[in-house]
Interface confidence: low
Amino acid sequence: GWVWNQFFVPEEMNTTSHHVGRLRSDLDNGNNSFQYKLLGAGAGSTFIIDERTGDIYAIEKLDREERSLYILRAQVIDITTGRAVEPESEFVIKVSDINDNEPKFLDEPYEAIVPEMSPEGTLVIQVTASDADDPSSGNNARLLYSLLQGQPYFSVEPTTGVIRISSKMDRELQDEYWVIIQAKDMIGQPGALSGTTSVLIKLSDVNDNKPIFKESLYRLTVSESAPTGTSIGTIMAYDNDIGENAEMDYSIEEDDSQTFDIITNHETQEGIVILKKKVNFEHQNHYGIRAKVKNHHVDEQLMKYHTEASTTFIKIQVEDVDEP
């Protein structure tokens, strides 16, 4: 019968002919009366056989990622009789893997949005690289992920490519981060190949800033002839948050005279000081009131950022009008 060994040929061989192995019948006594033949796809072009000895050689560079195995047929003939010594038999030559492919991130570009001030350990996104080398062949396609850029705010799980927050971030200081992840094959050992990808991580706003008055003192004037409902001036606070989180409401905190009111212009986020009761220069020529400002929407769990409302003092001077 046939004496079989497993046949392997390393991919990307740079020798002109590589000895793959030998076909042999146990009836072959070495007196050169047998002739070995190779048939099938690749026979005669990729693989040749020494008909006398049965030695098979690869004469082309092979790429495992293109084709990982060749199925060939073997024949052995007794040249004195022209008859087959063994039944024709199918066998396989496997192309063995070398680490000739770097990891590639196929789903680029990566982009993620995560709320600012998210706690350590919050999952941001998972990046995945693929390696065309053989996953069953050593560590050629076993990947390790690492962070090239993004410390100290982000970390990556070495085996999964899961990016997590490792330090709280404040959108008001920086609203987006470019993280660069490297994937290395050979589990990072010497000779490893690597690929990189960039991840744009945008921070969404949370209401972690209270509105603060731009000025601690405002000076306004009102004519004693002004009717109730007159707008006598505006005050303004700023809030480092954006959108709904920056919407604010102004109100009177202190006005013993109950002469003034403040309404909020929700388009401009200004407070408009309104005359609630008519004033009389001869009766009182100046007033001091205190206004406060608060956010319109505050989540229960963010109340710690909004404990004390910002206040401002408003001095209002009454202008005299000549009376008949």
């Epitope: 350590e120 100290p152 330090s167 404040d170 200081l173 603060i212 601690s216 710690k304 950022y305």
Partner: antibody, heavy 120, light 111 residues
């Protein structure tokens, strides 16, 4: 009222290390950053670094990188600052100062200071 | 050499108004809140002004802070003898990723 109580004065030889402690009380220890600031005799204030006690995240001033280690113990509400390879110019009063809930918010409470003298 | 520049000394007579300046750059004063600390002789620093112009409770309204662009200033009106101290500005610096203090200003109240 927030309190920060620091360990007592130390005298060290050049090349040695010193570890100063700062015990915090009357606030939620894990919510606030803690900084260390030093002041050499007759000199100004110099920021050394900052730690967030909950995760142990630290940022050190470039000048002290490699020589300073800041740690926190949440079970005792204490932060520590260790300075190694001491030299005479490290003679200073070392203060711990409570920061805000964000890295860039002011230091509102300070410890009483710990005098470290480096002398052969 | 401090990242924030303050005059080394300032003086005034009781009742006068004194201003102390603090000059920085875009990465510090230009990007973040300025804070001021008062250090009385032989004591730990004390927060005097925070977030540019806010006073902690217990700080008299004679002390006020302001900021414009990359500079800030501390004003003390109605100067009193107990105001004699060292004053420091401090701010978080984005490019250094850390805090910076001014060199300090020694305020003398002349009698």
């Amino acid at each position: 009222q927030v309190q920060l109580v620091q360990s007592g004065a130390e005298v060290k030889k050049p090349g040695a290390s010193v570890k100063v402690s700062c015990k915090a009380s009357r606030y939620t220890f894990t919510s606030y950053y803690m900084s260390w600031v030093r002041q050499a005799p007759g000199q100004g204030l110099e920021w050394m670094g900052i730690i967030h006690p909950s995760g142990g995240d630290t940022t050190y001033a470039q000048k002290f990188q490699g020589r300073v280690t800041m740690t926190g113990d949440t079970s005792t509400s204490t932060v520590y600052m260790e300075l190694s390879s001491l030299r005479s110019e490290d003679t200073a009063v070392y203060y711990c100062a409570r920061g805000g809930i964000k890295l860039w918010l002011h230091f509102d409470y300070w410890g009483q200071g710990t005098l470290v003298t480096v002398s052969s | 050499q401090s990242v924030l520049t303050q005059p080394p000394s300032a003086s005034g007579t009781p009742g006068q108004r004194v201003t102390i300046s603090c000059s920085g750059s875009r990465s510090n004063i230009g990007s973040n809140f300025v804070n001021w600390y008062q250090q009385l002789p032989g004591t730990a620093p004390k927060l005097l002004i925070y977030t540019n112009n806010q006073r902690p409770s217990g700080v008299p309204d004679r002390f006020s802070g302001s900021k414009s662009g990359t500079s800030a200033s501390l004003a003390i009106s109605g100067l009193q003898s107990e105001d004699e101290a060292d004053y420091y500005c401090a701010v978080y610096d984005e490019s250094l990723q850390g805090w910076v203090f001014g060199g300090g200003t020694k305020l003398t109240v002349l009698s």
